[in-house]
């Protein structure tokens, strides 16, 4: 029996008529009705209508509307399409070529795409091809000439040279870009450690130890401050190009004036930080002027701060300047900040420089110095001894060298020395002694010591300090001098008193205001003693007012 | 030749005294020099004690000066220390020496005794 | 109180070799006042250089000081068997007299 046809539902088109026409479905073979594709479908004879046909086996054709595919959807970069037809229909084919030097992604010189239900299969692609690279300082590990997308090219240093902290070997990708990188090694010397730090900035990266020659760094400012220069340095033969600067542009907070103030300085206060071009008016306070020697001015707020950066300058007074020994002969009385002022000495006296003038300078916080004229030093008096030099006047720091006649030293086998002409004159005399003038250690002295580690061998006018012990008074000057091969008197530590509670206690008395077990009294000192309760003095009133000589005390009595 | 000899008893009690003598011989006490005395405890290193000039003049160690004194005899041409209230710290080796004669204030020490053990313990 | 620090503290060398030895101390020392000395086990120490430099005598020349300040240095050109001992250095100018803690020169 033959199959009617039910009502065609055509994809991407329809019949014409269809509303009437679906009430004569189902509808036998042999029967046809015409029909028409949507926008971008064609029939199988490529017209935008024709007739579709009931047959045994249902409708024919049996994709009534076929997918097209427009030339102008395809965008094809580095390449083309050389056929003429415009218009493609589903699953046809079209070719296109790359042009030199590109290729498909397969790495071929053409390719070809299909139209397909949903339109082109692919956007076609022509990417470059990589040649091999030239090579810096490094040579190819192997032989091919050009490379295809993704293939990697190893590649190793000459001698002596290192691609990146040390490596001699390294690889290049073939991108759609070209070559990853270029194969270039470097000598290790060229290369710089990490770029060096500005005020108020910082690199944007954060630093490395080693950077490859032509590495770039990016600084930044922090905030209120500008990037002056370029914000990149560069390596180059192991350093780095200039760094830029970080110029403040912060506003002027209110100015703290040393020595001066703001006029109506409370009432403009809050409307601080002011921006740069402004100006207001100061004063400065005594002994203070304006640069412009005025007592009052204006400061104002620039890019750089406040000018003038010192808006109250010091002034100095002649009248503060005391001169001995020379005189000042310029008339004027007030000098500013930096102002410099003359002086003279008198003859026979010069400067510590040793000049006959010299020059203060006024200072923020006065005269920069008092001037001084000093004496100057004649040639000394030789002791055993005679000058090295022919001079016979010295200026201060002057050093004087002189030697020891035969038979005599300055120290310990020294027979040569040197003075210095100081303020007060001669550091020392150019003494030297007789070898059999010098002394040995200082004596011993009973319950004391020396304060100082003794030597074997001291030269003459050498002086050394005893001390007793607690309680033992020293009598006698605390240090000797050696003298002629001889120590002077040492001084004697003499014995104090030790008033004990059994001495006491035999004579019934006891200490007057004190009652300690046992006292000690230095040779000189007072001693009151009281007889003890229910006791009466035996001996005379001042045996109670004992004295300690060296050691003895005599004690009074009570029965 | 100047020689030196230490002698004096091995054993000393805690918190007893030290008493040590050290002889010179082949020479005088008298001369320009410096009698010391050097101690070392056993497996480290040396410290000095002491030292006495034939003045009778001494310098002594700070650390040690409370408990330490030190004499000459000229007639017997020696001289001694005595270091009081001994602890087992005061173990050692015990070497008197004397100091070279250069003209210098200060010498180094040339002549040493042998040594002698000192041990405290009860 | 002058520390004299001495370093290493020990050294192994072979017969021949040359040792150097160092002795830092805690503040400036007179060089005037620096002393070495050698100690062989169960014997007495022994002078081998005073005023930092000066040999002692009866010293080979093999043993050489030398240092100012707070840097001093003992060296040894050509090592004997003989040589193989403790050595101290000692300064001597002020009270109180010390000692560094000793290298040790060994046997390699």
């Known amino acids: 029996e033959v199959k009617p046809c039910d009502f065609p539902e055509i994809q991407h088109g329809g019949l014409y008529y269809k509303s009437l026409r679906r009430l004569y479905f189902p509808a036998a073979a042999g029967q046809s009705y015409s029909y028409y594709c949507d926008q971008n479908f064609v029939t199988p004879s490529g017209s935008y209508w024709d007739y579709i046909h009931c047959t045994q086996d249902g409708w024919s054709p049996t994709v009534p509307c076929l997918r097209t595919c427009s030339k102008s959807d395809v965008e094809i970069e580095n390449g083309f399409i050389s056929e003429s037809s415009s218009i493609y229909i589903l699953n046809e084919e079209t070719q296109y070529n790359c042009k030199p030097g590109y290729a498909t992604a397969e790495g071929n010189s053409s390719g070809s795409i299909t139209c397909l239900q949903n339109g082109w299969s692919t956007q076609p692609i022509c990417i470059k091809f990589c040649d091999m690279p030239v090579f810096e300082n490094s040579r190819a590990k192997s032989n091919g000439m050009w490379f295809k997308l993704h293939d990697t090219l190893d590649y190793e240093c000459y001698d002596g040279y290192e691609s990146s902290y040390g490596n001699t070997t390294d690889s290049i990708v073939c991108g759609e870009d070209g070559w990853s990188h270029l194969p270039t090694c470097y000598n290790s010397s060229e290369n710089c450690g990490p770029p060096p730090p500005i005020s108020n900035g910082d690199t944007t990266s954060f630093p490395q130890k080693v950077y490859l020659p032509w590495s770039r760094v990016e600084y930044q400012c922090q905030s209120y401050y500008e990037l002056q220069g370029s914000k990149y340095v560069t390596c180059s033969n192991g350093d780095w190009s200039e760094p830029p600067r970080c110029i403040s542009m912060k506003p002027c907070e209110f100015p703290e004036i040393q020595h001066g103030h703001l006029y109506y300085e409370n009432t403009r206060r809050p409307y601080f930080p002011v921006a740069t071009g402004q100006s207001y008016s100061y004063y400065c306070d005594q002994n203070f002027v304006t640069p412009s020697g005025s007592y009052w001015d204006y400061i104002h707020c620039t890019q750089d701060g406040w000018l003038p950066t010192v808006p109250c300058l010091r002034t100095c007074s002649k009248s503060d300047i005391e001169i001995e020994n020379g005189f000042i002969s310029e008339s004027s009385s007030i000098y500013i900040l930096n102002k410099e002022i003359q002086y003279k000495c008198k003859p026979g006296y010069a400067t510590a420089d040793g000049n006959s003038s010299g020059s203060i300078t006024c200072l923020q916080n006065g005269w920069s110095a008092q001037p001084i004229c000093i004496k100057f030093c004649d040639m000394p008096v030789f002791e055993n001894s005679r000058a090295k030099s022919n001079g016979m006047r010295f200026k201060l720091h002057d050093t004087l060298d002189y030697e020891c006649y035969d038979g005599y030293e300055i120290s310990y086998g020294n027979t040569t020395g040197s003075i210095v002409c100081g303020e007060d004159g001669w550091s020392h005399f150019p003494t030297c002694y007789n070898s059999s003038e010098k002394c040995g250690p200082p004596p011993p002295i009973s319950n004391g010591d020396t304060t100082s580690f003794l030597l074997k061998v001291y030269v003459p006018q050498s002086r050394v300090e005893y001390q007793c012990q607690s309680y033992y008074e020293l009598q006698g000057s605390n240090y000797v001098t050696c003298s002629n091969g001889e120590w002077s008197e040492p001084p004697r530590c003499i014995h104090p008193c030790i008033i004990t509670e059994e001495n006491m206690n035999k004579n019934n008395i006891q200490l007057k205001g004190k009652s300690d077990i046992k006292y000690y009294a230095k040779t000189g000192d007072t001693i009151e003693f009281m007889c003890k309760l229910g006791y009466n003095a035996n001996t005379s009133v001042l045996s109670f007012q004992a004295v300690c000589r060296e050691g003895i005390v005599e004690y009074p009595r009570c029965e | 030749q100047v020689q030196l000899q230490e002698s004096g008893p091995g054993l000393v009690k805690p918190s007893g005294t030290l008493s040590l003598t050290c002889a010179v011989s082949?020479?005088?006490?008298?001369?320009?020099?410096?009698w010391s005395w050097f101690r070392q405890p056993p497996g480290k290193g040396l410290e000095w004690i002491g030292e006495i000039y034939h003045t009778g003049s001494t310098n002594k160690n700070p650390s040690l000066k409370s408990r330490v004194t030190i004499s000459l005899d000229k007639s017997k041409n020696q001289f001694s220390l005595r270091l009081r209230s001994v602890t087992d710290a005061d173990t050692a080796v015990y070497y008197c020496a004397r100091d070279q004669y250069t003209g210098s204030p200060r010498d180094a020490f040339d002549i040493w005794g042998q040594g002698t053990m000192v041990t405290v313990s009860s | 109180e002058i520390v004299l620090t001495q370093s290493p503290g020990t050294l192994s060398l072979s017969p021949g070799e040359r040792a150097t030895l160092s002795c830092r101390a805690s503040q400036s020392v007179s060089s005037s006042y620096l002393a070495w000395y050698q100690q062989k086990p169960g014997q007495a120490p022994r002078l081998l250089i005073y005023?930092?430099?000066s040999r002692a005598t009866g010293i080979p020349d093999r043993f050489s000081g030398s240092g100012s300040g707070t840097d001093f240095t003992l060296t040894i050109s050509r090592l004997e068997p003989e040589d193989f001992a403790v050595y101290y250095c000692?300064?001597?100018?002020?009270?109180?007299?010390?000692f560094g803690g000793g290298t040790k020169v060994e046997i390699k």
């Open positions: 005023g930092a430099s």
């Open positions: 000692q300064h001597y100018g002020n009270s109180p007299l010390t």
């Open positions: 082949g020479g005088s006490i008298s001369g320009s020099h410096w």
